[in-house]
């Protein structure tokens, strides 16, 4: 999906209002310095591409993020403010259902959500030069 035509300011507002709080809740009890950010993004469409991938695509050691509260709200925000997004997700959801395991917060998931927090922070500051 090409995130170029999304309403970035509304997605940012939804993130600041509630999605960010849900990410913090998920990470509660984890030190903010525990994980190094290894995933980066260069502009808002790229950031949303990476956020979508880390949130909804199962990875080795972490297959359960798509059912978390922050993921449900992320999906809602992308569907509402990115034209045609919801129509592109049918195949992705079928793959997700096959990969889904019981909800277990593994260290790998915590690391992945830490990466997500970094991507969202970068999404919110699009004018900053890449480090």
């Amino acid at each position: 999906y090409d995130f170029t035509n999304c309403d970035f300011e509304k997605i940012k507002a939804a993130y600041l209002s509630t999605i960010s709080k849900d990410l913090i809740t998920y990470m509660s009890g984890t030190k903010s310095t525990e994980f190094n950010n290894t995933v980066s993004c260069s502009n808002r469409p790229h950031c949303l591409t990476e956020i979508q991938s880390l949130t909804f695509n199962p990875t080795a050691g972490c297959a359960s993020l798509a059912k978390e509260m922050f993921a449900m709200k992320t999906k809602a925000a992308l569907a509402i403010w990115c034209p045609g997004y919801s129509e592109t997700q049918i195949n992705a959801t079928q793959a997700m259902k096959k990969a889904r395991k019981s909800k277990v917060t593994t260290n790998k998931c915590l690391e992945q959500v830490s990466q997500l927090q970094g991507l969202w922070r970068r999404f919110n500051r699009p004018l900053l030069k890449q480090q």
Epitope: K10, S17, T18, K75, I80
Partner: antibody
């Protein structure tokens, strides 16, 4: 304007199934999660589950797994809830409720259907 | 599962009286995830207060909401006849979504 129109009251036999509908208009049906909420006579509200019509993704309250099946038909902008193996405990009003971001970007159930009464009786 | 405990369950207030309804949450949640709904008999619930303190469209300014962590409240500064209803708090912090048992507010 956003409207959720639910199907009419149902009187059904114990052990049978019933499927109630919630037709949406005034917004992009595929892009919003649809919730279902149960209210027994004189009681409070109980969340059953939700469906994302765009891809059919669902999340259920564990108390209703096996009892309810949520589906959506994008061609008619209609969400459905099927209740199976009905008992008197299932006699209630069932609401559909869209969830979305309000003007302050808080996420909540912002539009509700008028409710469908299901009575289980022999 | 997050449990929301409302108090009182039932109360009556005179016109002009100040009314406070509380919602205690079993584990701490973000204030952005606590909402209030109003329901009058035989009708569907209406969104009333979003994110602890933000009034939904059309809600009179005599209503207000506050709280954080595990303790939240809805306040009516001057009770009016049209405020007689049942009020529910609800959390959107974790699954399953849960509601308080409701506070039925009657006109004295």
């Amino acid at each position: 304007q956003v409207q959720l129109q639910q199907s009419g009251a149902e009187l059904v036999r114990p052990g049978s199934s019933v499927k109630i509908s919630c037709k949406s208009s005034g917004y992009a049906f595929s892009s919003y999660w649809m919730n279902w909420v149960k209210q027994r006579p004189g009681q409070g509200l109980e969340w059953i589950g939700q469906i994302f019509p765009g891809d059919g993704d669902t999340t259920y309250n564990g108390n209703f797994k096996g009892k309810t099946t949520l589906t959506a038909d994008k061609s008619s902008n209609t969400a459905y809830m099927q209740l199976s193996s009905l008992t008197s405990e299932d006699s209630a009003v069932y609401f559909c409720a869209r969830s979305g971001f309000d003007y302050g970007y808080f996420y909540a159930m912002d539009y509700w259907g008028q409710g469908t009464s299901v009575t289980v009786s022999s | 599962e997050i449990v929301l405990t409302q108090s009182p369950t039932l109360m009556a207030a005179s016109p002009g009286e100040k009314v406070t309804i509380t919602c205690s949450v079993s584990s701490s949640i973000s204030s952005s995830n606590l909402h209030w709904y109003q329901q009058k008999s035989e009708t569907s619930p209406k969104p009333w207060i979003f994110g602890t303190s933000n009034l939904a469209s059309g809600v009179p300014v005599r209503f207000s909401g506050s709280g954080s962590g595990t303790s939240y409240s809805l306040t009516i500064s001057n009770m009016e006849a049209e405020d007689a209803a049942t009020y529910y708090c609800q959390q959107w912090s974790s699954y399953p979504l849960t509601f308080g048992a409701g506070t039925k507010l009657e006109l004295k």
